[in-house]
């Protein structure tokens, strides 16, 4: 056969569907490939070929549109599935072509279970919902062109295993699920269950998706430097392990880029010669809040570096902030019996300030 | 660590009613949902419903339509199991168990409740 | 509903014997199956979730295999404390269901 550019397998689209659903899949070729779409491609004189391999097998063999019941179609650039089973699982290829030109592409299709509760390996969109915000609502996804406008569909919401109705904070209003005022509590997986007939028959839609409560843009303020402080000095000897946390707290903030950045001298450390390291650790609230904590260490401190400025900065989309660490060298110690002579009391260190050894 | 404490046994007349409580301690009551399962003496175990205790709702085996009603009291973390119009196979001993709302395992257990169903 | 077949209905073993435990669906569950295992006048544990996922505590000789339509736990070394009745539980469809129980008892 004649060349045809072959854009492979195209895996960034891993399609899921659950069995025994109606599916409908797009050939991806007009979606993310070709600059034209079916109908222009089609007025070309152009076909639209479907076949596949399924799973564990290398064969390519056509896909059969003559099953009863029309259980597997195509119309215009959509393969029909009416309904799934378990083992439609494979490799779908779509190919557009005619006597000059050719092009094609394969995807993954894999049918999966589901349990009574919706468990399943689908994997499942997050929808984040701001705590205590007022109405927000979230919509069943991916239920468009499965049913004409003029057929009125119903749809059950579930969050887990349970049926939503009545209830005082979510309430089901057809494809919307409403918020009333989102808690903590709101977290977990709900799922539309859109059920609607054609031609005789009665079809289901199941769309899963994750709720997540998180921080509210209301409460939301610029990072916050709880370390380096005041309250603590860093005082070493020369020779000595010298360890500064930066610990900054971050609002939820919607597609923020939250930044923790130290400096020495005003210098980024990679753009100095002294030999530092930094470790990052990351923790998140219930609500998304975050915690960055920065660990800068320096093995060996030598009395230069202990004049030197070290200064940790943040930065979100909420603003930018800077806090300089306290760093002195300890002051030996006066001997006892130079103390005696001068007529001083042992006294200690007496500098007040907190010595901290991080280990 | 999670408790499940089930009321104490009970002795029933046939046609009568019983209802079981089970009191959750030790997690987020409405984080999770709360099973019925029931054992009949040296029998196995027979799943009779459960109840989500955020929304109240239930799902109910179709063995116990219409005799069973479960609910949930969030202010007091207890569940209830209300089974009507007894007869002497439903003498059993009753246990609640915990799952999520998304769980189909039941990760705790109650101590398990004695009916028995005698004239 | 789906029916769970357990067999043998009893294990006669020694502490320290494998013992084979199967559960077996009257139709796909996928891996959506519980095993428990319960003692005389004890509420039932959970030890298998997932039909090959340990529950928290419980020990590594506990395992769970199988997809579909048969699934197997298995105890590697019987302990003294394994002796008990062991149930698997499919959650796949309403209402769920337990198997009839395998009795494990010292030979």
């Known amino acids: 056969s004649e060349r045809c550019d072959d854009w492979g397998l195209d895996t960034m689209r891993q399609i899921q569907v659950f069995e025994d659903e109606p599916a409908r899949i797009k050939c991806p070729l007009f979606e993310h490939f070709l600059k034209f779409n079916y109908s222009t491609a089609h007025s070309a004189g152009l076909t639209l070929i479907w076949y596949w391999t399924r799973q564990d097998r290398d064969l390519e063999e056509p896909i059969n549109f003559r099953l009863p019941e029309n259980r597997i179609s195509k119309e215009k650039d959509v393969l029909w599935f009416r309904p799934t089973l378990l083992n439609d699982t494979g490799n779908y290829t779509c190919m557009l072509r005619n006597t000059t030109y050719c092009s094609k592409v394969a995807f993954p299709l894999e049918v999966v279970q589901k349990d009574s509760c919706f468990n399943s390996p689908m994997k499942l969109p997050v929808h984040k919902l701001y705590i205590e915000y007022g109405i927000q609502r979230i919509t069943c996804p991916n239920v468009d062109g499965y049913f004409p406008s003029s057929v009125k569909p119903t749809i059950t919401w579930y969050m887990g295993c349970y049926k939503i109705q009545n209830f005082n904070n979510v309430i089901p209003e057809g494809m919307n699920l409403s918020f009333l005022i989102a808690l903590i509590s709101n977290n977990g997986n709900y799922t539309c269950v859109v059920t609607y007939p054609e031609n005789g028959r009665t079809f289901h839609l199941t769309r899963t998706l994750t709720v997540k409560v998180v921080g509210s843009p209301k409460n939301a303020v610029p990072p916050v430097i709880h370390s380096p402080n005041d309250h603590v000095v860093y005082e070493k000897e020369p020779g000595e392990e010298l360890l500064i946390p930066c610990t900054v707290y971050f609002s939820f903030l919607m597609d923020s880029r939250n930044e923790v950045w130290w400096t020495i001298d005003g210098k980024k450390p990679d753009d100095i010669t002294i030999d530092v390291t930094i470790n990052e650790s990351i923790s998140h609230s219930r609500t998304e809040d975050e915690t960055r904590t920065q660990i800068l260490s320096i093995k060996k401190v030598t009395s230069e570096d202990l004049k030197r400025s070290y200064v940790c900065h943040a930065r979100s989309a909420k603003g930018e902030v800077a806090k300089a660490a306290k760093v002195k060298q300890k002051v030996p110690a006066p001997r006892y019996t130079v103390e005696l002579a001068c007529g001083f009391g042992a006294t200690g260190s007496g500098s007040g300030s907190h010595h901290h050894h991080h280990h | 660590q999670v408790q499940l404490v089930q009321s104490g046994a009970e002795v029933k007349k046939p046609g009568s009613s019983v209802k079981v409580s089970c009191k959750a301690s030790g997690g987020t009551f409405s984080s999770y949902a709360i099973s019925w399962v029931r054992q009949a003496p040296g029998q196995g175990l027979e799943w009779m419903g459960g109840i989500s205790a955020i929304f109240g709702t239930a799902n109910y085996a179709q063995k116990f339509q219409g005799r069973v009603t479960i609910t949930a009291d969030e202010s007091t973390s207890t569940a209830y199991m209300e089974l009507s119009s007894l007869r002497s196979e439903d003498t059993a001993v009753y246990y609640c168990a915990r799952h999520l709302h998304n769980g189909i395992h039941l990760d705790y257990w109650g101590q398990g409740t004695l009916v028995t169903v005698s004239s | 509903e789906i029916v769970l077949t357990q067999s043998p209905a009893t294990l006669s073993l020694s502490p320290g014997e494998r013992a084979t435990l199967s559960c077996r669906a009257s139709q796909s569950v996928s891996n959506f199956l519980a095993w428990y295992q319960q003692k005389p006048g004890q509420a039932p544990r959970l030890l298998i979730y997932g039909a090959s996922n340990r529950a928290t505590g419980i020990p590594a000789r506990f395992s769970g295999s199988g997809s579909g339509t048969d699934f197997t736990l298995t105890i590697s070394s019987l302990e003294p404390e394994d002796f008990a009745v062991y149930y698997c539980?499919?959650?796949?469809?309403?209402?769920?269901?337990f198997g009839q129980g395998t009795k494990v008892e010292i030979k």
């Open positions: 539980q499919q959650g796949k469809h309403w209402p769920w269901t």
